[in-house]
């Protein structure tokens, strides 16, 4: 299907009647683009199709072609004065010069990136104008998931094990499904996080916590919703008896939750044998995923922080087997898994997860439009909450507590510190009056921030302009009536005085009185006209 559109100017909103008139006078150029989004894989080339119908005798010298980003009007590529003006978009765009004369204004976008996703407008001007927008949907397949176990050895039936399914470099965000060996979906105790890298591609990490039976198979499916591509992996766990001799290192099973800017303690302990001295201890804290050193203690000495000087041990407690790490001024970037590695004579290690969180601010509510509202008007309510982590869940409801799910658009944007600003937009048709509440929930802190707005739709009264016209005319009417009364009073007084002078004079006064009253009557009717207009 092609979408056809002719537009009387570039992004200019003309009043309906005026626009229609302009259209009739000039005739718009019909520009055709695909109705469905163009799906392009990251790193490949994409063609954004756009065509127009050239009239007989058309030459490229007459053509003015502009490709631009619909939302920002940023120039992407242009053709003017019979010449390709080249790419204004990272030198990754090209036209099809040999096809332009036949009305093919398509754009080739090379080495597609996630940041390219969005709407591109093809604007064609010959004598008339026409434009249409085409959507680019970027996609990248997810890698085959890798599965990791924690703990990954000495597993016994009844142990709780954390299975992590990780899939990398996909776009857009994935859907993750878990199931057991019998194909039964596993939905409880699943935590899925998706983190975008610098290129905007997502790494998805889904964590399933299960209690081991005799043995079991666990499968993870990562689905790309745009490509409808499924990537599977599974792991079979067979618990076994544990060998002896290793240092038993204990860490909390659940993630340590820390607020941004506060200090967090990553607990880790071991059981020192009798006669143990710190000179024998080799303690290393490192990032589980990269082995990057965080903090170490060797040769009976604290070797200090290798992690932005924000870590510390508890030296007085080490001899008792407390190898915990204090992480100061926690940042979003600290989130992840830290391994506590203890070596005395034997070795032992365990990983502890740090979950970073930040509360969301009380939502602020804005209305658009925010005045002259009447029942039946469509109003846009925006609920904004700032500097939270991780991404929020947003819920809308009306005054009766009924959830509002339709016509809601929520966007979340991370700042340089990784904290999210959430903006949720609700579009509603006003009733006589109504209350609309927005709830922003931090899923980790289970903290809810509320905001609400009550809108009272005004009855169908005059608009303020009409009100002032009415008041003005009323004042004029009163003034005229006062003037009329004054004139009448003068005339009556005058006729009374002249009555004594004779009948002839009285007739003349009657005529004069009639003449005097005539324009007043005219003015009166004029005022009536004014009231009707108002």
């Amino acid at each position: 299907m092609l979408r056809r559109r002719g537009s009387p100017g570039m992004g200019v909103h003309v009043g309906a009647a005026l626009g229609a008139l302009w259209f009739c006078l000039t005739g718009a150029l019909e520009v055709q683009v695909p109705e469905d989004p163009v799906v392009a894989l990251v790193g490949t080339d994409a063609t954004l199709c756009c065509s127009f119908s050239p009239e007989p005798g058309f030459s490229l010298a007459q053509l003015n072609l502009i490709w631009q980003l619909t939302d920002t009007k940023q120039l992407v590529h242009s053709f003017a004065e019979g010449q390709d003006q080249g790419s204004a978009y990272a030198n990754r765009t090209a036209l099809f010069p040999d096809l332009l004369a036949q009305g093919n204004a398509s754009l080739r976008l090379q080495r597609v990136r996630v940041a390219d996703e969005g709407s591109f407008t093809c604007f064609v001007s010959i004598r008339d104008f026409g434009s249409a927008a085409v959507s680019l949907q970027v996609a990248a397949p997810y890698s085959k998931p890798s599965m990791t176990l924690e703990p990954n050895k000495d597993l016994r039936p009844g142990d709780t094990v954390t299975i992590t399914c990780s899939s990398y470099q996909g776009y857009p965000e994935a859907e993750v499904f878990w199931q057991d060996g019998q194909g039964v979906p596993l939905t409880g105790n699943v935590t899925t996080s998706q983190m975008a890298n610098e290129q905007g591609l997502f790494d998805v990490h889904s964590i399933l916590r299960v209690v081991l039976g005799a043995n079991g198979t666990y499968s993870c499916l990562v689905r790309n919703p745009v490509l409808q591509q499924d990537a599977h992996s599974s792991v079979t766990i067979t618990p076994q008896r544990s060998p002896t001799g290793a240092v038993e290192v204990q860490v909390p099973e659940d993630p340590v939750v820390a607020l941004v800017g506060t200090d967090a303690t990553l607990r880790c302990s071991f059981s020192p044998e009798p006669g143990f001295s710190l000179a024998q201890l080799n303690l290393i804290w490192q990032l589980t995923d990269t082995k990057q050193l965080v903090h170490s203690f060797t040769e009976g000495r604290d070797q200090g922080s290798a992690y932005a000087n924000r870590t510390a041990l508890f030296p007085d407690l080490l001899a008792q087997g407390n190898a915990s790490l204090r992480l100061q001024r926690v940042r979003v970037a600290d989130e992840g898994s830290f391994t506590c590695f203890v070596s005395i004579r034997d070795f032992g290690s365990a990983a502890v997860s740090l979950q970073v969180a930040a509360p969301y601010s009380k939502p602020s509510m804005t209305l658009e439009p925010n005045k002259d509202l009447r029942p039946g008007d469509t109003v846009t309510i925006t609920c904004s909450s700032y500097r939270g982590y991780p991404e929020a869940e947003v819920f809308w409801q009306d005054g009766q507590g009924v959830p509002l799910t339709g016509n809601v658009t929520t966007s979340q944007m991370a700042n340089e510190q990784g904290l999210f600003d959430v903006h949720s937009v609700l579009r509603v048709v006003l009733g006589a009056n109504g209350t609309y509440s927005c709830l922003v929930r931090n899923p980790v802190l289970q903290q809810d921030a509320h905001g609400s707005v009550t809108i009272t739709g005004q009855p169908m009264t005059f608009p303020p302009e009409a009100l002032w016209v009415t008041v003005g005319l009323s004042v004029c009417l009163i003034a005229l009536l006062v003037a009329l009364a004054f004139v009448c009073w003068r005339k009556i007084k005058q006729s009374c005085e002249e009555e004594n002078a004779g009948a002839e004079d009285q007739d003349g006064e009657g005529e004069g009185s009639k003449t005097a009253l005539q324009p007043l009557k005219h003015s009166d009717s004029k005022e009536d006209d004014g009231q009707e207009i108002a």
Epitope: S146, T148, S166, T290, K291, Q292, S349
Partner: antibody, heavy 118, light 109 residues
Framework: EVQLLESGGSLVQPGGSLRLSCAAS????????MSWVRQAPGKGLEWVSG????????YYADSVKGRFTISRDNSKNTLYLQMNSLRAEDTAVYYC???????????WGQGTTVTVSS | QSVLTQPPSASGTPGQRVTISCSGS????????VNWYQQLPGTAPKLLIS??QRPSGVPDRFSGSKSGTSASLAITGLQSEDEADYYC???????????FGGGTKLTVL
């Protein structure tokens, strides 16, 4: 029995490419970091590359950075080393080794020979 | 030149005690596990010692110790089958790389 078995070594011309594989068995492959280590004829051991259990982190020796790529397929219990732009000095026996949590390369394969010569 | 320094050769007579040293820095041996590997002629390296831990199957004639940024491997009651190349190795935090010693060729006279 815990075992690592390398394959893919052969004679290749300078500038050519080769892909080595290492098949793991007898342990939970997806739980371990893995490494490639090489030994040139008559020389000592030289570490080449390492990869995390999930494949998300990779490390390389300066001598191979930009030319070699380490990867793994946990579903197939297999480690790979893609070698491009091969040079004469890459001639060696290539071993894959299991890298455990305690920073010990505790299990080694028997090695596969790569000869780069015109 | 290797990051870890080992003597190129060592020798001893059967029954004797031989020590091989390995010197590194605070970013490797100083804080990470030091591993010793034995490579018999024509075979793959085999883990001998980690710090002072012996894997099962390694005779107790082999022992390891570590002090500061140095480590040593001691072999007591030297036997002819101990004739091999011995390498020390450790993960290095600064280089984000495994580092090996140049190897010590042990000859049993």
């Amino acid at each position: 029995e815990v075992q690592l078995l390398e394959s893919g070594g052969s004679l290749v011309q300078p500038g050519g490419s080769l892909r080595l594989s290492c098949a793991a068995s007898g342990f939970t492959f997806s739980s371990y970091w893995m490494s490639w280590v090489r030994q040139a004829p008559g020389k000592g051991l030289e570490w080449v590359s390492g990869i995390s259990s999930s494949g998300s982190a990779t490390y390389y020796a300066d001598s191979v950075k930009g030319r070699f790529t380490i990867s793994r397929d946990n579903s197939k219990n297999t480690l790979y080393l893609q070698m491009n732009s091969l040079r004469a000095e890459d001639t060696a026996v290539y071993y894959c080794a299991r890298w455990n949590d305690y920073d010990i390369m505790d299990v080694w394969g028997q090695g596969t020979t790569v000869t780069v010569s015109s | 030149q290797s990051v870890l320094t080992q003597p190129p050769s060592a020798s001893g007579t059967p029954g004797q005690r031989v020590t091989i040293s390995c010197s590194g820095s605070s970013s490797n041996i100083g804080r990470r596990t030091v591993n010793w590997y034995q490579q018999l002629p024509g075979t793959a390296p085999k883990l001998l010692i980690s710090n002072s831990q012996r894997p099962s199957g390694v005779p107790d004639r082999f022992s390891g110790s570590k002090s500061g940024t140095s480590a040593s491997l001691a072999i007591t009651g030297l036997q002819s089958e101990d004739e091999a190349d011995y390498y020390c190795a450790s993960w290095d935090d600064s280089l984000n790389a495994w580092v090996f010693g140049g190897g010590t060729k042990l000859t049993v006279l």
